[in-house]
Every structure is written in structure tokens, then in C-alpha cells.
Amino acid sequence: IPVIEPSVPELVVKPGATVTLRCVGNGSVEWDGPPSPHWTLYSDGSSSILSTNNATFQNTGTYRCTEPGDPLGGSAAIHLYVKDPARPWNVLAQEVVVFEDQDALLPCLLTDPVLEAGVSLVRVRGRPLMRHTNYSFSPWHGFTIHRAKFIQSQDYQCSALMGGRKVMSISIRLKVQKVIPGPPALTLVPAELVRIRGEAAQIVCSASSVDVNFDVFLQHNNTKLAIPQQSDFHNNRYQKVLTLNLDQVDFQHAGNYSCVASNVQGKHSTSMFFRVVESAYLNLSSEQNLIQEVTVGEGLNLKVMVEAYPGLQGFNWTYLGPFSDHQPEPKLANATTKDTYRHTFTLSLPRLKPSEAGRYSFLARNPGGWRALTFELTLRYPPEVSVIWTFINGSGTLLCAASGYPQPNVTWLQCSGHTDRCDEAQVLQVWDDPYPEVLSQEPFHKVTVQSLLTVETLEHNQTYECRAHNSVGSGSWAFIPISAGAHTHPPDEFLFTP
């Protein structure tokens, strides 16, 4: 550890005195402290000497000597008082900057230790300290305001009692800075902008921070715009707002606009796109196929995306038939706005009934005109089957009618015994009808097909079954010949109409 001569912790001298402070160490030594230019510094072998032959109050201070090569970082210090009856204070700086909740040292050093009992801290012009100001005093270092708050950013003076009167130091400005969590918060509105050439437009870029030291600017396609800035302070935040007003937009105003704000913590930026168009537009589209097939009893949501400027003046869903003149209930129609110029319109069709198949059209209107988008909804049905015994051209024939959507295909089975449904063990014969006759096939309706099975002689202890199936399900009808006449059995599960 270096050694200072004179080897006293404090030295009190009068103005004009010669003072020599010598620091000696094992290796090279250095004097450290805030700027104290009223000294001469020179080296003498392994010692470093601070000297003045005309001490003034400005030489008052703590002088620390360190040994840079010492790994333990030892140091020695001496405090010098130059007690000037006219100058009780040596102020090392007129501005102190700290962050909130740090201790703030106001460096007014007492030039005479005897005056310590009568010192106080005041605000300039004799104003008392703010309430809850917690401070302490050290004659070596000055006044410390503990856990300084932003509101304590004031001009202070140190006061000492000399001969019954208060003598003030020059003022010290304390700047307590807010702890800045990051770059300023930004908003750029609108997030997207569309205008027809000749219309007016406004873009507002605003930034806010707990600290006033930040910059904000608006740029268009990387060109910084010269816009007057409005400043405000509310909710304990500083706000800076840039407003770009365009009375008559043209195509050169279009493009990317970026709002950029920066402070010591870094930079934030956000962008928006401004589109200038020649005239109004209205575009309808759907991510769905416009031809929809849904099983009866299930639900369906029809979705239309709308891109429009100016905004819509009207829109609605219309049922175009063919089954009834009912219209979709308004409560089933839903509109959501994705952003200013894009919307999604949804028509919910829960538990679809047969009469709800058909065409659904979404119509929208804005100053650009009318547009429509039409969906075709076909319902899928499982097959319904019926069998009758008849004579065609003198031949006994089983006639099977199957109705459903998509078009059912038909299989005949002959099995032993009387049964509602042939199982594998009973099956005697199977006929596939690859091309049943289509009896009816209208849009949005079931497809009805007919299959004929010519039977020369009906076996009385057997069952003839017509089975039909499609992608939705299957249906069957069992025909049992009895001596008194044919007897048919539709399966139990098809005794209802969905």
C-alpha cells in the first residue's frame, strides 16, 4: 500500500501556504481524484509529488494515491482543508447527474472542519428542501441525497454558519434521470393507409419515454421528413408527436413510412404502407371453394374476404333458391374487420336442412359499385331404398329405387331364409348393378336411380335385398316373397326421415 507524507488523514492550512504531498510506493504511484489543476505534479524516483506554493480554497479536497501495478489495488488518501474565512465552500462541479434511486453526491467541500456543525443544504434562493429529502453530510465529500428521485432535480446550495451568518456556496444543479427501460415506445397511425388521388391524408408518428432525452423522426422511403414536433408530458411520460398532413395526395406520396425513435438505450422503428389509387375499388374473394358439398344435418360457415376503399356502404347475404324464398337470418351473418381496408364476412349455416341447399350470394357496395360472390351448396344424403315386385314385358321383376347424394350405386343380394338383412353366411348370390338408370338428377336435389332384377321364379324361402351406398352412408330394402304375395321389409334404421 502506498504511503502519503505528511502521514496524517487530514491537513489544515491557510491560504497562501506551500503544500507538498508526497506519495511513495514499491512501484510507480499515481495521484487520483477529480480535476485539481491548481497543483504541480512531478515524479521523484518511486514517489509522486503534488505541490503548490500558493494554496487556495480550490485546493481543498481528498487526494488519493494508488499503485497501478499492485494487484490488491491498495490506496492511501489525505484530505486537505485550506480554510479561507471568505470561502467556506469549494464546489467541485456545478452539475451532478445520477439515475433515480442512486445516491447523489453534491460536491461542496467544506474548507474549514470547524464549520461542520452549522452546515445545511438548501435549494437556491433560500427555498427549503422538498419533503422526504433524505440527506447526509461529509466534510470531505459534501452532501449526499440518498435514493434521489426525479422530482429532486433542482438547483441546490450548501450553507455554512460563519460568525452568525449563513454563507452560501455557488449553486449545484442536480439532474436525476429516470431509469430508462429501453428505447422509446412508438405509435404510427394509421397502420395502413389508402387514398384516392386528390384526397387528404394524415399520418401521425408519436414516441414516448420516461426521459425527455430522445429523438423521433418520420421518414418516407428512407427520406427524413421535416415536420414540426409537438411535445407534451402526461402520465409521467414525455411525448413527442409528428403529424404529416397531406391536403391532396398524389402517387409520389405513396410508399413506406417509418416512425423512428431513439435514446441512449437504442432505437425503435415501426412502418406503415400508404397506397394511392386512381379510383375506388371493391374486391371479393374466398379461400373456400365456391362449390360446397355438406352432409345434411351438419353445419357450414361461408366466408368472404372483402378488400375495399372507400368503406362499404352496404352488404348482405342472399339466398337465391331454388327451394324456398327464405333469407338467411341476420344473426347468422358475422362481420370481422381484419384491418381498415380488409374485412371478413361469415354466414353460419348450422344443422343444414334439405330446404337450405342452393345458392348463397354475398353482395357488397361502395362508391366503386356493386360486387357479388355466389356459393353453390349441395347437400349430401345417405341413400333411401325401396323395392317393389312388378311385371315388365311379362317378366317378373324386382324394381329397386335408391335416392341420395352423391349418386348411390346398387347391389342385389339373394339369401336363404326370411331376414331383414342378408348376412354373409346366408348369401346365395350377389349382383352388382354398375349402371343403374338415373330417374332424376337436378341441381341441389338428391339423385334417384332405379335398378331392375329380373327373376323368373321367386323362391319362397328366400330373401331378395337391394343395397345402395354412397360416400355418406348406405341403405337397404329386403323383399320376402310369400305365398299370399310379396312382402317387403325396409330396415328399421331407415324408418325415419332426417
Partner: antibody, heavy 117, light 110 residues
Framework: QVQLQESGPGLVKPSETLSLTCTVS????????WTWIRQPPGKGLEWIGY???????NYNPSLKSRVTMSMDTSKNQFSLRLSSVTAADTAVYYC???????????WGQGTMVTVSS | QSVLTQPPSASGTPGQRVTISCSGS????????VNWYQQLPGTAPKLLIY???QRPSGVPDRFSGSKSGTSASLAISGLQSEDEADYYC???????????FGGGTKLTVL
Amino acid sequence: QVQLQESGPGLVKPSETLSLTCTVSGGSISSYYWTWIRQPPGKGLEWIGYIYYSGITNYNPSLKSRVTMSMDTSKNQFSLRLSSVTAADTAVYYCARGRIIGAFDIWGQGTMVTVSS
Amino acid sequence: QSVLTQPPSASGTPGQRVTISCSGSSSNIGSNTVNWYQQLPGTAPKLLIYSNNQRPSGVPDRFSGSKSGTSASLAISGLQSEDEADYYCAAWDDSLNGPVFGGGTKLTVL
């Protein structure tokens, strides 16, 4: 030994704020005081301000209204902010260590800052 | 306009002795010590002389400084080609509470 390194953007637009950081390695910024000095192209040296670890700052009166210096002892860094810059602020900016008698014994290599739109 | 006044240029031949002057006022050189800096082309300034006449370790004793009243001077003896540089004087200014610099002297070794 102690070394200083300036960092920050080399180009700043007029009216914006110039922000520079000086990182001190090989020693602690809790000793000595630390200063910023600049040198416009082809011209002499101009002192900007200094900061001492206790928060004591002092700025050149000609720049005082635009200058803020701060210190982050946890990162061993000190920084300079110069607001509302103009082309006249184009210079090489140096950070340096200050000795007690007002001499600057260790300097960073300097960083060129151009103010231009 | 620099606070301290230096000649803009000086020159000498190798081996010669060259002196650079620096003039100030009572608020700077008159009441505080003078420091000198050497700036080689394209590099940062380097402390050459502090406290009027003290050399930091590593600075050759060919460089010496002196002060009288409100003026100071830097002398370089045995001039060498590597001494070609800009030289700046500086002193603390009490009214500024900070350092002031001279405008710099460009030394050319002929």
C-alpha cells in the same frame, strides 16, 4: 494496461442526437475522471466535457445546452450524447482518461462522426 | 478560434533544436500548469509533457517544457524524422473549469 475504445454510429442526420460510448478495459472507471474531446477535420482539439465516477460532470459552456454525459460503472463504460447536431459537429471524437492536474494520459483511437442528411 | 495561441507551423532539420511557443492568459496558463500533446498523422494525441515540464515514462528526454507567466514553450532537441507531427499545448482554464487547447503547430522535419 488501461485501454479505451469509442463506439457509435459514424453517420448522424442533422438535428438528430449523436450518441457515443467509451468502453474502458484494464482498469476501473471508478477512479480518475473521463473526458470527451473532438477534432473537426483538419482542425484543432476541442474539449467537450468530463465526468467523474460520483456523477460529477462539467461541460464546455459552448456545448453545454446540447451535451449529456453519463457513466455505467457495471459495464465500465461512459457515454456522450450531443443533441441537435449540425454539420459543424462533424469530427473525430476521442474519449480520454483525465489525471488530477488536468492532463489526459490515455486516449481512445477516436471515431469519425459525420453529420449529413 | 483557439484560446491558447500557437504558431501554425514550425520546421527544422534532423539533429536541430526546435521550439514551439504557446501563449495564454491569467485564467489558464497564468494560474495552472501546462500540458503538451503530440499527434502523429492519423493517430490519437499522446501526452508528451505534463505539469509544465514533466515527461511521462517512455517519452525521450529530447522533449522538454517550460512555463513563464502566461506563456509556455516546448523544446525538441536532436530533431528526428519521427518527430514530424502536430503539437498541441493545453492548460486548465478557471473560467471554463475545463481544459483549453492551442490551435496546434505542424512540425515538419526537413
